[in-house]
């Protein structure tokens, strides 16, 4: 008799989750040599072991600790980049600007960029068939809970100026409800950072409106300015302008506004 | 068993580019980084850079920056290194490589390699 | 970048001699050295990686050792299958480079 299974609203673990977990560990250790200490097995046995025969309702950040000392790695705290709804072009960015970190620069983020994973409570199966959905189901869901884990301390690890890219074409260029808005915002501490400079990327050619003065940016403003942080805020008018004088400074067109 | 297969060799004119393709099989292209190593005529080998192909993330070694383009088509389970401006000293075989996993950080398997001439 | 000085060069031996290279990196590189062999027209081929470990299905009478600077590959009894070019590599930092490698001749 086949067991009953929970039926989830959200999509299921990522095929071959384990494979590409080790896999990514790998080549992440390969390319930073400076994580070479880290044995992907046991990364891969603690991050198994955070969310396995446990109801992927009920997860924990505890449930995550292991996985964080395994992973604990130190980026320059001046040179972090946060991000909210524009991840494609802050990876773009940090590929060209290398001493620039994004949360997905590191191994743990790394990991788990673009993954979904959940087991069943008292199973050691993974749930390929469907995993809870933040909204629909519970927000202690292993992704969602390893994703304000991971957020929280990179935030807390932040120091002087933090940049943020922010997507100027969404009706909500800050949302207080995104994991910048609702996790890194409280947690960036205010004896180490000095300013929260966030760069507003529009995306339509002829936008030509000053994006700094929307009343969401007004309102991360507030939020930042109340925990005794400056904020100072940049229109990206061409991000592939943009992108092109980061990769190519000395070039002429490069003093002009972007 | 993991295999590497290169495409054939080419001759190319002076400022000409050329593209080597190295098709994998016996893994997925984006478990692993793709290097890509050079060797002239009676010389050493030297390394020209690696790409993450899941990311599209490249390390291109100083000597070559500007001048080489490395790609992966995921779809293809392909890896792709282009090489541009070419002259007479960049005349060598070209061999994609990779890391496994019982082996720390070296290469254990290679394309069989792709001989690139450069000449007027 | 980090230099690998291979020596020596090229070297003559007897089948049945025992055959040492040394590769000296320019700075400190662990135990970050891998070993490979390449004969005329064929790719490289991984014999030890990690300064010490022979990698799977190499005969046991190639070697390695070392750590930091100094690097020893040692064929203990030299086979006539042996003859071949034998490269140190460095794979510490980026950018991985290669020693200018031994050309190994029977006599």
């Known amino acids: 008799v086949p067991r009953w299974r929970q039926q989830w609203s959200g999509p299921g673990t990522t095929k071959r989750f384990p494979e590409t977990v080790l896999a990514r560990c790998v080549k992440y250790t390969e390319i930073h040599p400076e994580m070479r200490h880290v044995d992907c097995q046991s990364v891969w046995d603690a991050f198994k072991g955070a969310f396995i025969s446990k109801h992927p309702c009920n997860i924990t950040e505890e449930d995550y600790q292991p996985l964080m000392k395994l992973g604990t790695q130190t980026v320059p705290c001046n040179k972090i980049l946060l991000w909210s709804r524009i991840k494609d072009l802050a990876h773009q960015f940090t590929q060209v600007q290398r001493d620039m970190f994004t949360l997905e620069d590191t191994l743990l983020g790394y990991l788990a960029d673009d993954l979904t994973w959940c087991g069943e409570f008292n199973t050691s199966k993974i749930n390929y068939q469907s995993c809870p959905d933040w909204r629909k189901d519970c927000s202690n869901n292993p992704v969602s809970v390893f994703w304000k884990t991971v957020s929280r301390r990179f935030a807390e690890a932040a120091c002087d100026v933090v940049h943020v890219m922010l997507n100027g074409s969404r009706s909500k260029i800050f949302d207080k409800n995104s994991t910048f808005g609702s996790v890194e915002v409280h947690n960036l501490q205010p004896e180490k950072v000095q300013t929260l400079e966030a760069w507003v990327i529009h995306g339509g050619r002829e936008d030509s409106r000053d994006l700094c003065q929307d009343p969401t940016i007004k309102e991360l403003e507030s939020i930042i300015s109340k925990r005794n942080i400056q904020f100072s805020c940049k229109n990206i008018y061409r991000p592939d302008k943009f992108l092109q004088c980061v990769k190519n400074p000395e070039d002429s067109s490069c003093t002009s506004e972007i | 068993q993991v295999q590497l297969v290169q495409s054939g060799a080419e001759v190319k004119k002076p400022g000409a580019s050329v593209k080597v393709s190295c098709k994998v099989s016996?893994?997925?292209?984006?478990?692993?980084?793709m290097n890509w190593v050079r060797q002239g005529p009676g010389k050493g080998l030297e390394w020209m850079g690696w790409?993450?192909?899941?990311?599209?993330?490249?390390d291109v070694a100083q000597k070559f920056q500007g001048r080489v383009t490395m790609t992966a088509d995921t779809s293809t389970d392909t890896a792709y290194m282009e090489l541009s401006s070419l002259r007479s000293e960049d005349t060598a075989v070209y061999y994609c490589?990779?890391?496994?996993?019982?082996?720390?950080?070296?290469?254990?398997?290679w394309g069989q390699g792709t001989t690139v001439t450069v000449s007027s | 970048d980090i230099q690998m000085t291979q020596s020596p060069s090229s070297l003559s031996a007897s089948v049945g001699d025992r055959v040492t290279i040394t590769c000296k990196a320019s700075?400190?590189?662990?135990?970050?050295v891998d070993w490979y062999q390449q004969k005329p027209g064929k790719a490289p081929k991984l014999l030890i990686y990690?300064?010490?470990n022979r990698y799977t299905g190499v005969p046991s009478r190639f070697s390695g050792s070392g750590s930091g600077t100094d690097f020893t590959f040692t064929i203990s009894s030299l086979q006539p299958e042996d003859i071949a070019t034998y490269y140190c590599?460095?794979?510490?930092?980026?950018?991985?480079?290669f020693g200018g490698g031994t050309k190994v001749e029977i006599k």
């Open positions: 990690k300064a010490s």
């Open positions: 016996g893994y997925t292209l984006t478990d692993s980084v």
């Open positions: 700075q400190n590189v662990d135990s970050d």
């Open positions: 490589a990779r890391t496994g996993y019982n082996s720390g950080y070296g290469f254990p398997y």
């Open positions: 790409i993450d192909p899941e990311y599209g993330r490249t």
């Open positions: 590599m460095q794979s510490n930092t980026h950018p991985r480079t």
